[in-house]
């Protein structure tokens, strides 16, 4: 039975040209995390594998940095980066847990971090 929950940074905003850290945390399970995938809508951004380490998709290499931890740092943000991001935790023996983050990239200097929330 899958007992874990994914806690994410929730709905967040950041300024155009700035950077942002996408973070997820898996709790309430003893399952082993074997791999974490980061996706933006229908694009694979990066993978962090327990054995192989990080793989950043070549098309995002200039603007995506691994970490901190299992998180992902997006740099040189543009308004086109606005949208949904997903952290997909592959675990053994539980299976797959998915967390969602919505990022809004703002033209102005009004950028706030949203409250944390949980996805069961």
């Amino acid at each position: 039975m899958m007992t874990g929950t994914i806690e994410t940074t929730g709905n967040i905003s950041a300024e155009k040209g700035g950077s942002i850290i996408l973070q997820c945390h898996l709790s309430s399970t003893t399952a082993q995390v074997t791999q974490v995938n980061w996706e933006q809508q229908d694009q694979l951004l990066a993978i962090c594998n327990a054995d192989l380490g990080w793989h950043i998709s070549p098309s995002f290499k200039d603007r995506v940095a691994p970490g901190p931890g299992l998180g992902l740092t997006l740099q040189s943000l543009t308004v086109n980066d606005t949208g949904e991001y997903f952290c997909i935790y592959h675990t053994y023996p539980d299976g797959t847990y998915t967390g969602r983050i919505f990022l809004e990239v703002l033209e102005s200097s009004v950028a706030e971090h949203g409250a944390r929330f949980q996805i069961p």
């Epitope: 694979l44 594998n49 192989l52 793989h55």
Partner: antibody, heavy 118, light 107 residues
Framework: EVQLLESGGGLVQPGGSLRLSCAAS????????MSWVRQAPGKGLEWVSA????????YYADSVKGRFTISRDNSKNTLYLQMNSLRAEDTAVYYC???????????WGQGTLVTVSS | DIQMTQSPSSLSASVGDRVTITCRAS??????LNWYQQKPGKAPKLLIY???SLQSGVPSRFSGSGSGTDFTLTISSLQPEDFATYYC?????????FGGGTKVEIK
């Protein structure tokens, strides 16, 4: 240099068994998922089975489920495919392939031919 | 199971031509789509992974695009060594499935 070398193929009668091996070298074998893919003569590619780096998770195509068993010995850097209750439609070249991050097959062996015929 | 449909099944082209092969998934597979090249009697060779990432050592004339259900492999200027059969493969979920292949022949 990454190398994958399959062996164990041959001629077997319907209902018979065969065990394929794939000897790996040039990389940390236990860090990679591995797959078996087959190709019937003149046909396309068909995925058969996969196994996680630790061997804890295994996956099978419906066409071989219950008849084939994938396994690995990380101390010997070797992947196996035990094939039982073989049928004529299992006739194919069998390839082993390395799967970094479980999502693509970046290195393949040269293949070993399995022929099931009476 | 996710079905992968490749088109065309074969095509004739000349050296220097721009060649496009398409692959359609029966459901969304995000960008978990790979392309392989196979020559007669040889093992498949990875060209493109994760829809658009060029595998190390593969010439830059090969490119991949698409996401969701529709994907494309493009060879910008066909070379003599490119005459082969090309397969797409989804790695979104098991069972992993391949397209039926596209044979690129000399015109």
């Amino acid at each position: 240099e990454v190398q994958l070398l399959e062996s164990g193929g041959g001629l077997v009668q319907p209902g018979g068994s065969l065990r394929l091996s794939c000897a790996a070298s040039g990389f940390t074998f236990s860090s990679y998922a591995m797959s078996w893919v087959r190709q019937a003569p003149g046909k396309g590619l068909e995925w058969v089975s996969a196994i996680s780096g630790s061997g804890g998770s295994t996956y099978y195509a419906d066409s071989v489920k219950g008849r084939f068993t994938i396994s690995r010995d990380n101390s010997k850097n070797t992947l196996y495919l035990q094939m039982n209750s073989l049928r004529a439609e299992d006739t194919a070249v069998y390839y082993c392939a390395r799967e970094p991050y479980d999502y693509w097959m970046d290195y393949w062996g040269q293949g070993t031919l399995v022929t099931v015929s009476s | 199971d996710i079905q992968m449909t490749q088109s065309p099944s074969s095509l004739s082209a000349s050296v220097g031509d721009r060649v496009t092969i398409t692959c359609r998934a029966s459901q969304s597979i995000s960008s978990y789509l790979n392309w392989y090249q196979q020559k007669p009697g040889k093992a498949p060779k990875l060209l493109i992974y994760a829809a658009s990432s060029l595998q190390s050592g593969v010439p830059s004339r090969f490119s991949g695009s698409g996401s969701g259900t529709d994907f494309t492999l493009t060879i910008s200027s066909l070379q003599p060594e490119d005459f082969a059969t090309y397969y797409c493969q989804q790695s979104y979920s098991t069972p992993l499935t391949f397209g039926g292949g596209t044979k690129v022949e000399i015109k």
